[in-house]
């Protein structure tokens, strides 16, 4: 299967971990498939929920992925780049705060450039409840990690804010920042940030980034 949409269409409609295959390759990767939300078929490319996984990782780790697909994890920039350059994908970002509120941002067009172009993110067609301005800077920026500084700031955003992300200088979001528990999650410049929903210092409780073909 190329993605969770193909898994779903084959009759596997239960949430869980499935083995996907890189486009035009035999290389495999394990991903969590959400087969319930919004019609199912979602490939989860990022999840934060409890702080159990360190997201301050190297370029290579963000390239190939890390963590546990059933819990906190990053699927891998290379797979996502290859996948989203095959056809049109949508990206949905689901967010939870510490007060029981949920919100989402949906981008109707999403792809990552190749590693040669630093996995630059491209997003269009924003809708949703997590802000009418995109908290991922538009146009998209190159991906940066602690050992791969591609942001627009002399400050090295990934080291300062922690985590790999499409930093601007440093920009209004970072879903791969430090995980802060409840009552320690405010006034945190390096937390899990989605500015146009909760502001600059609020660190979120949980985040999920998921993709699905636009024609699903």
């Amino acid at each position: 299967f190329r993605d969770c949409a193909e898994v779903f269409k084959s009759g596997h409609t239960t949430n869980g971990i499935y083995t996907l295959t890189f486009p035009n390759s035999t290389e495999e990767i394990k991903a969590y498939c959400d087969m319930e939300a919004g019609g199912g078929g979602w490939t989860i490319i990022q999840r934060r929920e409890d702080g159990s996984v360190d997201f301050q990782r190297t370029w290579k780790e963000y390239k190939v992925g890390f963590g546990n697909p059933s819990g906190e994890y990053w699927l891998g920039n290379e797979f996502v780049s290859q996948l989203t350059n095959q056809q049109r994908y949508v990206l949905k970002i689901h967010l939870k705060d510490w007060e029981g509120n949920e919100a989402y941002s949906l981008y109707e067009h999403f792809y990552l450039s190749s590693e040669e172009l630093n996995y630059r993110i491209h997003l269009k067609g924003l809708t949703g409840t997590a802000g009418k301005i995109s908290s991922i800077s538009q146009p998209g920026n190159d991906f940066s990690t602690k050992d791969g500084d591609n942001d627009k700031c002399i400050c090295k955003c990934s080291q300062m804010l922690t985590g790999g992300w499409w930093f601007d200088a440093c920009g209004p979001s970072n879903l791969n920042g430090m995980y802060y528990p409840q009552r320690q999650n405010t006034a945190k410049f390096n937390g899990i940030k989605w500015y146009y929903w909760k502001g600059s210092g609020y660190s979120l409780k949980a985040t999920t980034m998921m993709i699905r073909p636009a024609d699903f």
């Epitope: 350059n85 269009k124 995109s134």
Partner: antibody, heavy 121, light 107 residues
Framework: DVQLQESGPGLVKPSQSLSLTCTVT?????????WNWIRQFPGNKLEWMGY???????SYNPSLKSRISITRDTSKNQFFLQLNSVTPEDTATYYC??????????????WGQGTSVTVSS | SIVMTQTPKLLLVSAGDRVTITCKAS??????VAWYQQKPGQSPKLLIY???NRYTGVPDRFTGSGYGTDFTFAISTVQAEDLAIYFC?????????FGGGTKLEIK
């Protein structure tokens, strides 16, 4: 710096084909983004005609779909416009431009200087 | 196709004035709206994209705002070199479409 330059005949006869070339320097058209043709009619109205993406896929304005073809020569870093069965209503200044997005229509950040095409017998 | 209705068609202003141009989309264009400046004899130049993001090197007197169907472009303090035609463009749905243009003339 990215630069785009249109070239082609300034005069085309009705019912013939219009062929234009856009030569890109400073960026590989196979790396990223979409590469567009836009025209501006007398009176300044702008019309998007179509694009060829870095991956080679194309998208056309439905109003032109039966007449238009956009192709490329990656070895020369050029892309081309062919518009068939032209009429005097196709008289315009033709621009090539780069989109800020690679898989869909988008705003355009780099434009050529434009080439004027008159359709007349 | 989404129709972009741009108003006004002509703006006659003095240097130092603040000017506002509006574009109304016939259906939602999300935040996928750009604004261009075209000076006489030149090609269009991108000023604003994603409704409110200033393109690289564009002076901060140029601003954009809006979401959905209503979009606004403003020049806070008009300068003589701002003499041009200004166009809005939606690229939320294909084909992308342009407004009819606003000609800015300096008194």
């Amino acid at each position: 710096d990215v630069q785009l330059q249109e070239s082609g005949p300034g005069l085309v006869k009705p019912s013939q084909s219009l062929s234009l070339t856009c030569t890109v320097t400073g960026y590989s058209i196979t790396s990223d983004y979409a590469w567009n043709w836009i025209r501006q009619f007398p009176g300044n109205k702008l019309e998007w005609m179509g694009y060829i993406s870095y991956s080679g896929s194309t998208s056309y304005n439905p109003s032109l779909k039966s007449r238009i073809s956009i192709t490329r020569d990656t070895s020369k870093n050029q892309f081309f416009l062919q518009l068939n069965s032209v009429t005097p209503e196709d008289t315009a200044t033709y621009y090539c431009a780069r989109s800020t997005f690679g898989h869909y229509v988008s705003s355009m950040d780099y434009w050529g200087q434009g080439t004027s095409v008159t359709v007349s017998s | 196709s989404i129709v972009m209705t741009q108003t006004p068609k002509l703006l006659l202003v003095s240097a130092g004035d603040r000017v506002t141009i509006t574009c109304k989309a016939s259906q939602s264009a999300s935040n996928d709206v750009a604004w261009y400046q075209q000076k006489p004899g030149q090609s269009p130049k991108l000023l604003i994209y994603y409704a409110s993001n200033r393109y690289t090197g564009v002076p901060d007197r140029f601003t954009g705002s809006g979401y959905g169907t209503d979009f606004t472009f403003a020049i806070s303090t008009v300068q003589a070199e701002d003499l041009a035609i200004y166009f809005c463009q939606q690229d939320y749905s294909s084909p992308p479409t342009f407004g009819g243009g606003t000609k800015l003339e300096i008194k």
